[in-house]
Amino acid sequence: EAHKSEIAHRYNDLGEQHFKGLVLIAFSQYLQKCSYDEHAKLVQEVTDFAKTCVADESAANCDKSLHTLFGDKLCAIPNLRENYGELADCCTKQEPERNECFLQHKDDNPSLPPFERPEAEAMCTSFKENPTTFMGHYLHEVARRHPYFYAPELLYYAEQYNEILTQCCAEADKESCLTPKLDGVKEKALVSSVRQRMKCSSMQKFGERAFKAWAVARLSQTFPNADFAEITKLATDLTKVNKECCHGDLLECADDRAELAKYMCENQATISSKLQTCCDKPLLKKAHCLSEVEHDTMPADLPAIAADFVEDQEVCKNYAEAKDVFLGTFLYEYSRRHPDYSVSLLLRLAKKYEATLEKCCAEANPPACYGTVLAEFQPLVEEPKNLVKTNCDLYEKLGEYGFQNAILVRYTQKAPQVSTPTLVEAARNLGRVGTKCCTLPEDQRLPCVEDYLSAILNRVCLLHEKTPVSEHVTKCCSGSLVERRPCFSALTVDETYVPKEFKAETFTFHSDICTLPEKEKQIKKQTALAELVKHKPKATAEQLKTVMDDFAQFLDTCCKAADKDTCFSTEGPNLVTRCKDALA
């Protein structure tokens, strides 16, 4: 229903704490360079204004849209052009163009320093002094680095953070309590970020229909006992929630997500038998829990999919009658039978089925033409299954770091023009799929591997879009979202690439590497590995292994030496010479 004052409506629905958190996230995602204090000031002003509208919905400006109110706030920031350049031009536009302009200027890779976690004592001190400000800083720092982070989920992670600090800051050994717990939250939040970015990409590039198809497949896998009307309702509502969040309408998004959670909990009987535990939790935990709830038990007596979609004499009539509904029903029926498939694979199968009907229903004898469609799915299913087997075998043999290195070599050969930091980041993320998915039961591996890889490759595409350098990457990124992963997997060595000349300074290291944390050391070594491949794209695995082993030995020796600097300056050039010889 329409409200006199949108801002008062959202404030009342969300409550002050969530309202302020969401406004802070929104501002931090739009203006990524502003300091926390600048944003906190704006948030307070917006909140004070919302309260005046709650008291009197007819007060001045209370009837304005949220985009107008928030946009006016952002455009009033001093030195906007100096700090943000052409983003300031957005302020010359009217809504809704102004908001669209802000969205287009969101930067997926902002030049901000990595978010460093303070040491435990300092963290606990500032948390105890002012928990609200402390959590505000967390929301601000995450949101500005991840401008498409799913806002209500970020509130959930902040709540997790808060609970961990409350618990650990009361312990004697704060450090050993905080580190593993906060690392766990960070890992989950980073995965959440790339997954949500993929959803926004789907929405931005291919529209609501594409996202809704993704949602139908995913929900049908999770809720195989729900009927198609129920799945359609959930998918429609979920599409609206994600559209709002991807579009920067964070208050509406969070409000509608809470409504969806409420609906699901009130209609468990028609959705799933697995929801009760989630539904007993408070709002943020409830919505998070529902988003990753375990799959319900599949109905025992599901008929073969062929009955309705191949053997039925009226397939073409039913398809022509309501194409989207018929294809939606197919996707629903196939997905509920296959929780062991990735959503990407299910969407590829639905696309294949649609193409088959389009072709066959125009022919003289359609049943003879589409009769083999399910058999034609086989190669599409085998390809990702083989990918999972090959990669999980390799992961089990090499471990995470070795597996990342194997992927780094593979992807540097596929797209050597891509910047080394991007290749290293991508390979490290892709390599984590082993730890994340290969340890799961067999029937959960494929959905875990492929849907995670797709999300990571989406980030590769977004970064590459900013500065396109590789025709291979452009080709894979410009196709449909579900075809990206198979496209990247099929890429081979880029034969058009002219190898980089060997620069000794690229492979020159200093004693400061010895004191770096293990993760940073790995990144340095992986940077060197990518540069080696760029120098010798056709180097064999054996050659690269020889060089990397030599490099690791060199680091080990020099970092243990009494005079590290001398060791690095004398042994370093020898290492460079040996590398050149090994790769000659």
Partner: nanobody
Framework: EVQLLESGGGLVQPGGSLRLSCTAS????????MGWVRQAPGKGLEWVSW????????YYADSVKGRFTISRDNSKNTLYLQMNSLRAEDTAVYYC???????????WGQGTLVTVSS
């Protein structure tokens, strides 16, 4: 095009029974959730009952629970509503509805009038 044709309405005494039928055409009946909606004189539309495509799950409004039974025969493209222990407040036009999505319906028939009166 989609057609829904209700029948079986009429005048009945309180405590009596009626069976409504709805014959569907123009769409794949077995793929859709179907239901009955009613409108009492001077009132808004109210969901009475709905049934899943495969007939495995049924929903009833609190006001009719235990008295009404919905069923379907997918081979005949027909939906039924068995109404027992009828009361004066059940007087309404009953519409057969095709539901494309939970809590929404996109097509309904012309309706059949049920009058419960002594």
């Amino acid at each position: 095009e989609v057609q829904l044709l209700e029948s079986g309405g009429g005048l009945v005494q309180p405590g009596g029974s009626l069976r409504l039928s709805c014959t569907a055409s123009g769409f794949t009946f077995r793929h859709y959730r179907m239901g009955w909606v009613r409108q009492a004189p001077g009132k808004g539309l109210e969901w009475v009952s709905w049934i899943r495509p495969d007939g495995t799950f049924t929903y009833y409004a609190d006001s009719v629970k235990g008295r009404f039974t919905i069923s379907r025969d997918n081979s005949k493209n027909t939906l039924y509503l068995q109404m027992n222990s009828l009361r004066a407040e059940d007087t309404a036009v009953y519409y057969c509805a095709k539901s494309y999505m939970a809590d929404r319906f996109d097509y309904w028939g012309q309706g059949t009038l049920v009058t419960v009166s002594s």
